[in-house]
Interface confidence: medium
Amino acid sequence: GPETLCGAELVDALQFVCGPRGFYFNKPTGYGSSIRRAPQTGIVDECCFRSCDLRRLEMYCAPLKPTKSA
């Protein structure tokens, strides 16, 4: 059956994918389309109740910090 990711395993996988950037359980506001759906889709909906791959997990990483110029 489809593989799902829940609880502590979900957090562990997010830490693997996102590193110290951190992550959100809901996509950051303004992610992708500017039109927000209601209710907001979260990672538990996408990866625990359904299956998702590592690229999908990456969508829940915190945004990259802007590069500081030397």
Partner: antibody, heavy 115, light 105 residues
């Protein structure tokens, strides 16, 4: 001490299958996610697949998605990689690596795909 | 996707200091943890530096890591012949292309 020992490599024809194993000891096996990483002859390292510590979640590199399957048996402290539809470009040494930092590696097992 | 670029080779004489760079393209690696691996000839990779600058137990303090902006660096001081190896940086599941360190003489 932590020990990871791979086995199951060998020579296989294109389109064939192999199953690699990685036997683990010296740590609490069920507390760590595991990965397979490969290295083609004379080339660099390429991450292949990831499995969460309970085994309920897996992830794959695009190059192997749909052909390889990672699994684990937490009662036997063993990690597996089932490789189907093998191609010449899958020829490599395959390593199992522990955790998300790849802090321990096995010695590797060579897979050669050739006719 | 993250791409990590390393110089193909570096060299130095025994006792010298060498550095190996790891540069991220299209993503700011300053937001990630960078890990470094050493692969001696004919052996499996070994974790050398994790989380940018931390050394696992057993790794000599001649090895150090740092990170700034879009690049990370591995420094080796007091170069020894046994340091001759391939060195790889990584971010999560992405590896750099590797750098071959040659110890001269």
């Amino acid at each position: 001490q932590v020990e990871l020992v791979e086995s199951g490599g060998g020579l296989v024809q294109p389109g064939g299958s192999l199953r690699l194993s990685c036997a683990a000891s010296g740590f609490t096996w069920s507390s760590f996610a595991m990965s397979w990483v490969r290295q083609a002859p004379g080339k660099g390292l390429e991450w292949v697949s990831y499995i969460s510590y309970l085994g309920s979640y897996t992830g794959y590199a695009d190059s192997v998605k749909g052909r390889f399957t990672i699994s684990r048996d937490n009662s036997k402290n063993t990690l597996y990689l089932q490789m189907n539809s093998l191609r010449a470009e899958d020829t490599a040494v395959y390593y199992c690596a522990r955790g998300t930092k790849f802090d321990y590696w096995g010695q590797g097992t060579l897979v050669t795909v050739s006719s | 996707d993250i791409v990590l670029t390393q110089p193909p080779s570096v060299s130095g004489a025994p006792g010298q200091r060498v550095t190996i760079s790891c540069t991220g393209s299209s993503s700011n690696i300053g937001t990630y943890d960078v890990h470094w691996y050493q692969q001696l000839p004919g052996t499996a990779p070994k974790l050398l530096i994790y989380s940018n600058s931390k050394r696992p137990s057993g790794v000599p303090d001649r090895f150090s890591g740092s990170k700034s902006g879009t690049s990370a660096s591995l420094a080796i001081t007091g170069l020894q012949s046994e340091d001759e190896a391939d060195y790889y940086c990584s971010i999560t599941r992405v590896f750099g292309g590797g750098t071959k360190l040659t110890v001269l003489g």
